[in-house]
């Protein structure tokens, strides 16, 4: 289970209409459910139940986003529509280039994601918890554009690859 280095860049629009960027670094873990690959895209927050809709229709929104899912306590969802792995698969089917799970309230999900899968996803599935998860969710919950860049080695220059 390798460390995933995640850079999150928040884009704040300035009075002139340009963007000011703020970069936050945090760490998670690549799970065995997905590939240990770098990935980058706009963050899209997904509610766990939002991944339950099983219609196979693609919508008109763009591909290449990074899905962020805050998992709830198991007691709040005793009969989930999909396993955690199933939710990751559903997000990738809908165009996610990577999925990040906040497992702070559902640490059991770590074992589920790390059970050896015969058919692991070809995109990274990362989990974060604790202070890193709090930092991530604080950014995700803002009504602002944010991009995530996931790497499997520490970043050299934080903002080098980001442009809008």
């Amino acid at each position: 289970k390798e460390t995933a280095f995640v850079e999150v860049v928040l884009f704040e629009s300035s009075p002139s209409g340009d963007y000011t960027t703020y970069t936050t670094g945090l760490t998670g873990r690549f799970s065995r459910a997905g590939a240990t690959l770098s990935a980058e895209g706009e963050i899209v927050q997904m509610h766990p139940l939002g991944l339950c809709n099983n219609n196979d229709e693609e919508d008109l929104y763009e591909y290449g986003w990074v899905g962020v899912v805050k998992l709830e306590q198991p007691e709040l969802d005793p009969k989930p529509c999909l396993t955690v792995l199933g939710k990751a698969k559903r997000a990738v089917q809908r165009g996610a280039t990577a999925v990040i799970f906040d497992v702070s309230e559902n640490p059991e999900a770590i074992d589920q994601l790390n059970q050896g899968s015969e058919d692991p996803l070809k995109r990274p599935v990362v989990y974060v918890k604790g202070a890193d998860a709090i930092k991530l969710m604080n950014i995700v919950n803002k009504q602002k554009v944010a991009r995530a860049r996931i790497q499997h080695r520490p970043p050299r220059q934080p903002t080098e690859y980001f442009d809008m």
Epitope: H47, L49, G50, L60, E62, Y63, W65, Q143
Partner: antibody, heavy 117, light 113 residues
């Protein structure tokens, strides 16, 4: 630089057909849903049709369902709108637009379709 | 289909004054997954294609000056131009892109008084 260039507009008789094209450049075309939006002279905007990034799913306004067909060729970075059984009320400037979670962020300059006998 | 209704149809405002446009949707455009309102505002000047101004009901698009602001949630939304400039004369449209078919409001023409 993102560019969308529509073509294929022109004069057609009622009941006739026309095929519009939209050539896209400056972005990864097969990562984005695309739409056609039209505007009749002096009127407002009307969303006509949309297609998902892969082309697997298509969507239509009720006013064109069964008459218009949206398609795309991701190898050619091109979006199409096949318009059959054209009516006088289809007369409009037709725009293609790139779809995102931020709405339609880039638009072409439009191509005029005139339906008249 | 979601019906979008704008008011007023036209608006005449003095230079430097505030212009306010309202938009109501027939059902909520709040996206259940990410809690964002899939509501955009566009500006269209004569002979030009529309230009994206605001998305997620309140976030300014790149290059849009801060005199333009959006607010609202669920079914009721507002576009405000805090200090009207000559270059803001245009027709403004709201659009829901929450569910297909996407739909626009009928437009509001903003002129200088």
């Amino acid at each position: 630089e993102v560019q969308l260039l529509e073509s294929g507009g022109g004069l057609v008789q009622p009941g006739g057909s026309l095929r519009l094209s939209c050539a896209a450049s400056g972005f990864t075309f097969n990562n984005f849903g695309m739409s056609w939006v039209r505007q009749a002279p002096g009127k407002g905007l009307e969303w006509v049709s949309g297609i998902s990034a892969s082309g697997r799913n298509t969507y239509y306004a009720d006013s064109v369902k069964g008459r218009f067909t949206i398609s795309r060729d991701n190898s050619k970075n091109t979006l199409y709108l096949q318009m059959n059984s054209l009516r006088a009320e289809d007369r409009a400037v037709y725009y293609c637009a790139r779809e995102t979670r931020h709405g339609s962020d880039y638009w072409g300059q439009g191509t005029l379709v005139t339906v008249s006998s | 289909d979601i019906v979008m209704t704008q008011s007023p149809d036209s608006l005449a405002v003095s230079l430097g004054e505030r212009a306010t446009i309202n938009c109501t949707s027939s059902q909520s455009v709040l996206h259940s997954s990410n809690k964002k309102n899939y509501l955009a505002w566009y500006q269209q000047k004569p002979g030009q294609p529309p230009k994206l101004l605001i998305y997620w009901a309140s976030t300014r698009a790149s290059g849009v000056p801060d005199r333009f602001s959006g607010s609202g949630s669920g079914t009721d939304f507002t576009l405000t131009i805090s200090s009207l400039q000559a270059e803001d004369v245009a027709v403004y449209y709201c659009q829901q892109y929450h569910s297909t078919p996407y739909t626009f409001g009928q437009g509001t023409k903003v002129e200088i008084k």
